[in-house]
C-alpha cells in the first residue's frame, strides 16, 4: 500500500531505540496462537525447551506466556520524520527464567535461560497490522519477524510493507 522499498526503510534504526526504564509498563499471561488458530506450545526435552506450533485436542490446556511490555523511545533524528516516537516492545517468557530469543544467524526462535537485564535478542517490537492480531519484529534485526515455518517458530524476513500482513507472521493473544 505504501510502495516502500524494503522494511528497513519502514522500521529504521530499531537497534538504536532505547527502552525507557527497566521495568515493564504492564505484564500479563496469555496463550499464543497463530492466525489459523494453531497453538504455540513449549515442551521440555533433554533439559532444553522446544517450541511447537500444533493443533490442540479439544479441551487440551493451552500453554501460557508471560508478555512483558516495555516502552521504547525512538528519537526524532533516527525516526526519519522529525518526531520523537514511542514503540511497544515485548519479551515473551513461557516459564520462569526462560525467554524467547531471536537467533538471527540461524533464522530461528529459541528459548534461552538468562538473567535480567535481558539481551536485545529477547526484545520484539510489537505491531498490530491486522485486526486483533499482532506481529513481533526483532529489535536486533529490523524487518525480521517471528513467524511460522514447518510447524515451528522461525525468523522470517519481510521485504515490503505489503507482506507485513502475511498470515505466517500474525499471532493472536488470548487470556483464556
Amino acid at each position: 500500500a505504501f510502495g516502500i522499498s524494503g522494511v528497513q526503510k519502514y522500521t529504521r534504526a530499531l537497534h538504536d531505540s532505547s527502552i525507557t526504564g527497566i521495568s515493564p509498563i504492564t505484564e500479563y499471561l496469555a496463550s499464543l496462537s497463530t492466525y489459523n488458530d494453531q497453538s504455540i506450545t513449549f515442551a521440555l526435552e533433554d533439559e532444553s525447551y522446544e517450541i511447537y506450533v500444533e493443533d490442540l485436542k479439544k479441551d487440551e490446556k493451552k500453554d501460557k506466556v508471560l508478555l512483558s511490555y516495555y516502552e521504547s523511545q525512538h528519537p526524532s533524528n533516527e525516526s526519519g520524520d522529525g518526531v520523537d516516537g514511542k514503540m511497544l516492545m515485548v519479551t515473551l517468557s513461557p516459564t520462569k527464567d526462560f525467554w524467547l530469543h531471536a537467533n538471527n544467524k540461524e533464522h530461528s526462535v529459541e528459548l534461552h535461560k538468562c538473567e535480567k537485564p535481558l539481551p536485545d535478542q529477547a526484545f520484539f517490537v510489537l505491531h498490530n497490522m491486522h485486526s486483533n492480531c499482532v506481529s513481533f519484529e526483532c529489535k536486533t534485526d529490523p524487518g525480521v519477524f517471528i513467524g511460522v515455518k514447518d510447524n515451528h517458530l522461525a525468523l522470517i524476513k519481510v521485504d515490503s510493507s505489503e507482506n507485513l500482513c502475511t498470515e505466517n507472521i500474525l499471532f493472536k493473544l488470548s487470556e483464556t
Partner: antibody, heavy 121, light 107 residues
C-alpha cells in the same frame, strides 16, 4: 510538529455519500496508524475505522457495509467515504493518530480539529 | 464488541476536590485503556494511555489505575481548567469502543 486537518463538505443530502479527507504532516503514515472517529452533536465518541501503518484497514462492524477508508501516501492524505447517509450520520468527524509506532494499544495522541457534517435535504 | 461503561455520567465538584471516574469493560482488556479530556467545541485530548501512563504535557494531578476490566481516572485536586467531559476507550481489540463520557461540572 504533528498536524491532522479534516476537510470536506459540511452539508450532505440524505442517501448520498459523505466524503472527507484528512491531510497529515509532521509524521509518516508508514509508521503510525490513523483513525476516523465521529461525535454526533451533544453525544459521545464513536470509532469508525483505522488505516494501520502497514496499510491494512479495519472498520467498525456497525458501519462496515457503508464505510470505505483509503490512502494517498504521496499527498499525505487518507480519506473517509460513508454511503447512504441519513440524519443519524450528522456529526463532527475527527481524524486522529496513534500514540505508538506500529500499534494502536496506546490510544490516539494527536487529533484534528474536527469537521461538522450535517445530513439534510 | 467490548462495551465500556463509565460512571458517574456527571459529577459536580469544586476547585481543589478529588474526583474519581470509573470505567468498566465488558471483558478483559489487559492494560489497553486510554482516558481523554474534551472541552466544548474542542477535540479530545489524550490524558492517560496504557491504563496508567501519563501522556506528554499532562499535569501530574491526573492519574490512572486498573487492569483487566476495572479502571479509574483520578484528578487529585481539581483545577478550573479541568471542568470538561472525560472519556475512556479500550484499545485491546477492534472496534475501539469509548465509554459514554463523564461530565465534570462546577458545583
Amino acid at each position: 510538529q504533528v498536524q491532522l486537518q479534516e476537510s470536506g463538505p459540511g452539508l450532505v443530502k440524505p442517501s448520498e455519500t459523505l466524503s472527507l479527507t484528512c491531510t497529515v504532516s509532521g509524521f509518516s503514515l508508514s509508521k503510525y496508524g490513523v483513525h476516523w472517529i465521529r461525535q454526533p452533536p451533544g453525544k459521545g465518541l464513536e470509532w469508525i475505522g483505522v488505516l494501520r501503518a502497514g496499510g491494512t484497514i479495519s472498520y467498525n462492524s456497525a458501519l462496515m457495509s457503508r464505510v470505505t477508508i483509503s490512502v494517498d501516501t504521496s499527498k499525505n492524505q487518507f480519506s473517509l467515504k460513508l454511503s447512504s447517509v441519513t440524519a443519524a450520520d450528522t456529526a463532527v468527524y475527527y481524524c486522529a493518530r496513534d500514540h505508538y509506532y506500529y500499534s494502536s494499544f496506546g490510544g490516539f495522541a494527536s487529533w484534528g480539529q474536527g469537521t461538522l457534517v450535517t445530513v439534510s435535504s | 464488541d467490548i462495551q465500556m461503561t463509565q460512571s458517574p455520567s456527571s459529577v459536580s465538584a469544586s476547585v481543589g476536590d478529588r474526583v474519581t471516574i470509573t470505567c468498566l469493560a465488558s471483558q478483559t482488556i489487559g492494560a489497553w485503556l486510554a482516558w481523554y479530556q474534551q472541552k466544548p467545541g474542542k477535540s479530545p485530548k489524550l490524558l492517560i494511555y496504557a491504563a496508567t501512563r501519563l501522556a506528554d504535557g499532562v499535569p501530574s494531578r491526573f492519574s490512572g489505575s486498573g487492569s483487566g476490566t476495572d479502571f479509574t481516572l483520578t484528578i487529585s485536586s481539581l483545577q478550573p481548567e479541568d471542568f470538561a467531559t472525560y472519556y475512556c476507550q479500550q484499545l485491546n481489540s477492534t472496534p475501539y469502543t469509548f465509554g459514554q463520557g463523564t461530565k465534570v461540572e462546577i458545583k
